[in-house]
């Protein structure tokens, strides 16, 4: 196991997950850690505890390794980091990777007020409701700018979008969470259509899909541990 030293001179590795940081309960996920070609060992940590290690074979590419989680559960959802060793030196820690398990317990209802088809500039609010009490709700947009909004609430949360622009059009789903990394089943999708303006923008995004595998999240992380360029909207106003 890696020993903490003050002289962690090697650059930190990059960590990411495939196919997504959001994994349906029982499904598999790959966690990749990319360090250096000279790396002799990679170590993966989960919630601060030693999780797995890999010693890459010289015959293969040694600058990255894959850790396979065969069945994602609430016990494997949380924060992962990785390190690598080269010679006697260890790297700094990677940025944290937050893995979320979905498909737990119940399915929320999602609807939009005043209606799914609105004119440019109209005020729109999404509502997410879950029968089983939860602590937080998440609203996600498919195939778009990967916005994730979250709101605290017991059985319902509202997500005011304000005056909508064409950037708001697209397909949305919501989740209830039992903790930050354990989420409900996804709601049925709601597609927001925007009409009006100079051009006819009422078309929904092409090829909308109900599969979470098609959600395009940027899986690299920044210093805060949030997904870079995901434009997390962290509204924590109490309902």
């Amino acid at each position: 196991q890696r020993i903490n030293t003050e002289k962690e001179t090697l650059p930190k590795p990059i960590i990411w997950a495939k196919p997504s940081i959001m994994v349906t309960n029982g499904n598999s996920v790959n966690i990749w850690c990319q360090g250096a070609q000279s790396a002799s060992e990679y170590q993966l940590y989960f919630e601060g505890s030693f999780f797995a290690l890999e010693r890459p074979k010289p015959s293969r590419s040694m600058n990255k390794v894959r850790f396979f989680i065969s069945q994602m559960t609430s016990h494997t959802a949380g924060i992962y980091t990785c390190f690598y060793q080269s010679g006697e030196l260890w790297s700094k820690s990677s940025n944290p990777l937050k893995l979320v398990v979905t498909g737990l317990y119940d399915t929320p209802n999602l609807w939009v007020y005043p209606r799914p088809e609105v004119t440019l500039g109209e005020n729109v609010t999404f509502f997410c409701q879950l029968k089983t009490a939860t602590s937080k709700f998440f609203l996600l947009k498919e195939r778009g700018s990967n916005h994730i909004q979250n709101k605290y609430g017991n059985i319902q949360a509202e997500f005011p979008m304000g005056p909508v622009t064409r950037a708001h059009r697209g397909t949305y789903r919501c989740f209830g969470s039992y903790n930050d990394y354990a989420w409900s089943f996804p709601s049925e999708p709601v597609t927001l259509l925007i009409t009006g303006g100079v051009e006819n923008s009422s078309l929904a995004p092409t090829d909308p899909t109900s599969s979470l595998d098609y959600w395009e999240f940027d899986l690299s992380t920044n210093e805060s541990g949030l997904q870079k360029d995901s434009a997390f909207w962290d509204h924590t106003t109490q309902n």
């Epitope: 999780f51 010693r55 074979k57 396979f68």
Partner: nanobody, 126 residues
Framework: EVQLVESGGGEVQPGGSLRLSCAAS????????MGWFRQAPGKEREFVAA???????YYAESVKGRFTISRDNAKNTVYLQMSSLRAEDTAVYYC????????????????????WGQGTLVTVKP
């Protein structure tokens, strides 16, 4: 579905040896990473040793140099050879598997394992 059955436990004197076996059902054994964990009375389950599908191994500091993990893919079995046993090694020993896995990953955390045996008791006493 994978089933794991441990055997080889028993009572032994300090300094003695035992070999635990874990027989796995199914044809996926060669693609499994395997591990041994133990739980002493009144304590939490702890990692003992693990082996990757490509025979890389890793040991808890407390057993390093005394215990050896190995596998025989032809027999679908993983072994834990225990020597220089101490009173503090007394515990129920569990075999666990990560099925499937890839590469040469060695899993140390119990949450990584998706199949578990029922355990075999090892008692070390004079």
């Amino acid at each position: 579905e994978v089933q794991l059955v441990e055997s080889g436990g028993g009572e032994v004197q300090p300094g003695g040896s035992l070999r635990l076996s874990c027989a796995a059902s199914g044809r996926t054994f060669a693609s499994a990473a395997m591990g041994w964990f133990r739980q002493a009375p009144g304590k939490e389950r702890e990692f003992v040793a693990a082996i990757s599908r490509s025979d890389d191994t890793y040991y808890a500091e407390s057993v390093k140099g005394r215990f050896t993990i190995s596998r025989d893919n032809a027999k679908n079995t993983v072994y834990l050879q225990m020597s220089s046993l101490r009173a503090e090694d007394t515990a129920v020993y569990y075999c666990a598997a990560v099925v499937p896995t890839y590469g040469s990953s060695i899993y140390v955390h119990s949450a990584a394992y998706n199949y578990w045996g029922q355990g075999t008791l090892v008692t070390v006493k004079p």
